[in-house]
């Protein structure tokens, strides 16, 4: 750590005296801060010397010396007072800028430590401080106004009692700035806009800031618009509002509009798009396939997206058949608005029953006309199977009917013994019917197919099983020949 001679920590001299300050360290040393022209600075080996032959009150301040090579960053300081009977104050700055709630140091340094007891801070022309002002004083540094408020941003003077009279310093202007957390807050209304050519439109750009020093403008594409500004103050913030009013819009008014506001902290902008159309429009679409298949008993939500201008005058969901004349319950229909011109309409169909398969249509109307979007809903069913023994052209035939959706495929199994259902270990033979005969295939209904197994002689100690399956499930029916004829039964559920 460097050492200053004389040892200090304070040195009091009279104006006109010679002052020499020597700083000595292990390595090279240097004096901190700007050294005024009144001083001569020279190096002498490991020491640095500051000297002046004619000390003045303006030399009153703290002189600090550091040793750059010292890893601990040590320093030494001495405070020099040049006690001028006519000049009790040395003011280091005429303007001080702080943010609200910071401590503000007014750097008027006392030139004579003896005067400390009689110092006070006043406002310009001897006006008293606001009673809300709390300060402390340090003869080395000056007056500190604690947690400065904007309202305390005024001109101050430091006062010292000398021989019974108050002697003032030159004035110091304190500027207390509001803490600006960031660029102004912005709103641009509406977020998007559609108008038919010839209609009126209004776009409002507003910005707010905690102090009055901020700018705001509205820009169309790359052109800055000249719009009169309305100013206001509420919720402890300054507001600036720009309103663009268009009596009859045309295509040249369309495009991107940006609301831009800036303050000392930076710039903030937000944009919207204005679309001008020739006439009303109404578009319906769905992200879903319009042909839907759902397993019976399950639920389905049908969703339609609507883009429209002007707004909808009416809308509803309709069941178009073919099974019943029921209509969707209104409570199952739900509408949500994504934004001004886009809406989503949902029809919830919980626990679907066979009679609810068919066509569902969403209809909407605006001044542009009617539009409809129709969904076709087919229910999926697991196969139902039945087997009968019959004679066809004199031949004994097993006839298997399977009904379900999607269309079931059919497999015949022959297995040893009498059983309600063949398991893999018992299977003696498997026949797959690649093309069962389709008996019925109506829209929105089950598909019924028929498969024949011709058997001249059915072995008595065997079971014949018809199995049908599709994407939903499977069904089966077992046939057991008996001496007096035949017995058929479905497997136990």
């Amino acid at each position: 750590i460097p050492v200053i001679e004389p040892s200090g920590p304070e040195l009091v001299v009279k104006p006109g005296e010679t002052v020499t300050l020597r700083c000595v360290g292990n390595g090279s040393v240097e004096w901190d801060g700007p050294i005024s022209p009144h001083w001569t600075l020279y190096s002498d080996g490991p020491s640095s010397v500051l000297t002046t032959n004619n000390a003045t009150f303006q030399n009153t301040r703290t002189y600090r010396c550091t040793e750059p090579g010292d890893p601990l960053g040590g320093s030494a300081a001495i405070h020099l007072y040049v006690k001028d009977p006519a000049r009790p104050w040395n003011v280091l700055a005429k303007e001080v800028v702080v943010f609200e709630d910071q401590d503000a140091l007014l750097p008027c340094l006392l030139t004579d430590p003896v005067l400390e007891a009689g110092v006070s801070l006043v406002r310009l022309r001897g006006r008293p401080l606001l009673r809300h002002t709390n300060y402390s004083f340090s003869p080395w540094h000056g007056f500190i106004i604690h947690r400065a408020k904007f309202i305390q941003g005024q001109d101050y003077q430091c006062s010292a009692l000398m021989g019974g009279r108050k002697v003032m310093s030159i004035s110091i202007r304190l500027k207390v700035q509001k803490v600006i957390p960031g660029p102004p807050a912005l709103t641009l209304v509406p977020a998007e806009l559609v108008r038919i050519r010839g209609e009126a439109a209004q776009i409002v750009c507003s910005a707010s800031n905690i102090d009055v020093d901020f700018d705001v403008f509205l820009q169309h594409n790359t052109t800055k618009l000249a719009i009169p500004q309305r100013s206001d103050f509420h919720d402890n913030r300054y507001q600036k509002v720009l309103t663009l009013s268009l009596g009859q819009v045309d295509f040249q008014h369309a495009g991107n509009y940006s609301c831009v506001a800036s303050n000392v902290q930076g710039k903030h902008s937000t944009s919207m798009f204005f679309q001008v159309v020739e006439s009303a429009y109404l578009d319906l679409s769905s992200e879903q396939n319009l042909i839907q298949e759902v397993t019976v008993g399950e639920g389905l939500n049908l969703k339609v997206m609507v883009e429209a201008y002007p707004g909808l005058q009416g809308f509803n969901w309709t069941y178009l058949g073919p099974f019943s004349d029921h209509q969707p319950e209104p409570k199952l229909a739900n509408a949500t608005t994504k934004d001004t011109y886009r809406h989503t309409f949902t029809l919830s169909l919980p626990r679907l029953k066979p009679s609810e398969a068919g066509r569902y249509s969403f209809l909407a109307r605006n001044p542009g006309g009617w539009r409809a979007l129709t969904f076709e809903l087919t229910l999926r069913y697991p196969p139902e199977v039945s087997v009968i023994w019959t004679s066809i052209n004199g031949s004994g035939t097993l006839l298997c009917a399977a009904s379900g959706y999607p269309q079931p495929n059919v497999t015949w199994l022959q297995c040893a013994g009498h059983t309600d259902r063949c398991d893999e270990a018992q299977v003696l033979q498997v026949w797959v019917d690649p093309h069962p005969e389709v008996l019925s295939q109506e829209p929105f209904q089950k598909v019924t197919v028929q498969s024949l197994l011709t058997a001249e002689t059915l072995e008595h100690n065997q079971t014949y099983e018809c199995r049908a399956h599709n994407s939903v499930g499977s069904g089966s029916w077992a046939f057991i020949p008996i001496s007096a004829g035949a017995r058929t039964h479905p497997p136990d559920e």
């Epitope: 801070l121 406002r123 401080l129 606001l130 809300h132 002002t133 300060y135 904007f150 309202i151 941003g153």
Partner: antibody, heavy 116, light 112 residues
Amino acid sequence: EVQLQQSGPELVKPGTSVKISCQASGYTFTVYYMNWVKQSHGKSLEWIGDIDPNTGDSTYNQKFRGKATLTVDKSSSTAYMELRSLTSEDSAVYYCARYDGYIDYWGQGTTLTVSS
Amino acid sequence: DVVMTQTPLSLPVSLGDQASISCRSSQSIVHSNRHTYLEWYLQKPGQSLKLLIYGVSNRFSGVPDRFSGSGSGTDFTLKISRVEAEDMGIYYCFQGTHVPLTFGAGTKLELK
């Protein structure tokens, strides 16, 4: 010229509220505290409180806490005092007054009469 | 609360007389920032208050030099060197150091 223009006299019923205004002109409203003072008939003066028009921060005389609420509207350079749950004890002349290290300018006063 | 005691409550004077009003505070009104917030006000009938003296002894702008203030700590005095007709009214002392700020009861200056 510094002027503090207060709202006109008020005759109100007990239990109600009243809001007195004080519009400042001739100086920058936000750089001076605004004080409010009550003068009851034939009595001395009571300090109600003050407000920093810049932040809305207020200091109240404990006696008037809950009775008076001080607010400002910077856009119109107006200070307000709302008095609630009024009784005959609140009948008085109320002054707004600018503070600059001392109270240097006073409004003309607003007479409040509370009577059923 | 700081109680400001004014004496006398009534002061009959003749024009040209010297008048003296005393104000005593129940505790020191020297602020922690070293200022003494002691003011004197005059209220004429039907009017609001006018500031005469601030900071114990400083005359407010436009106040005639016949008005002077003095004192320290807890004892303060307002003097009018040569009373004029326009000086009649009620004089209030006021302390602005401690919350709540408080006024004296007032001294009525009237012609004998």
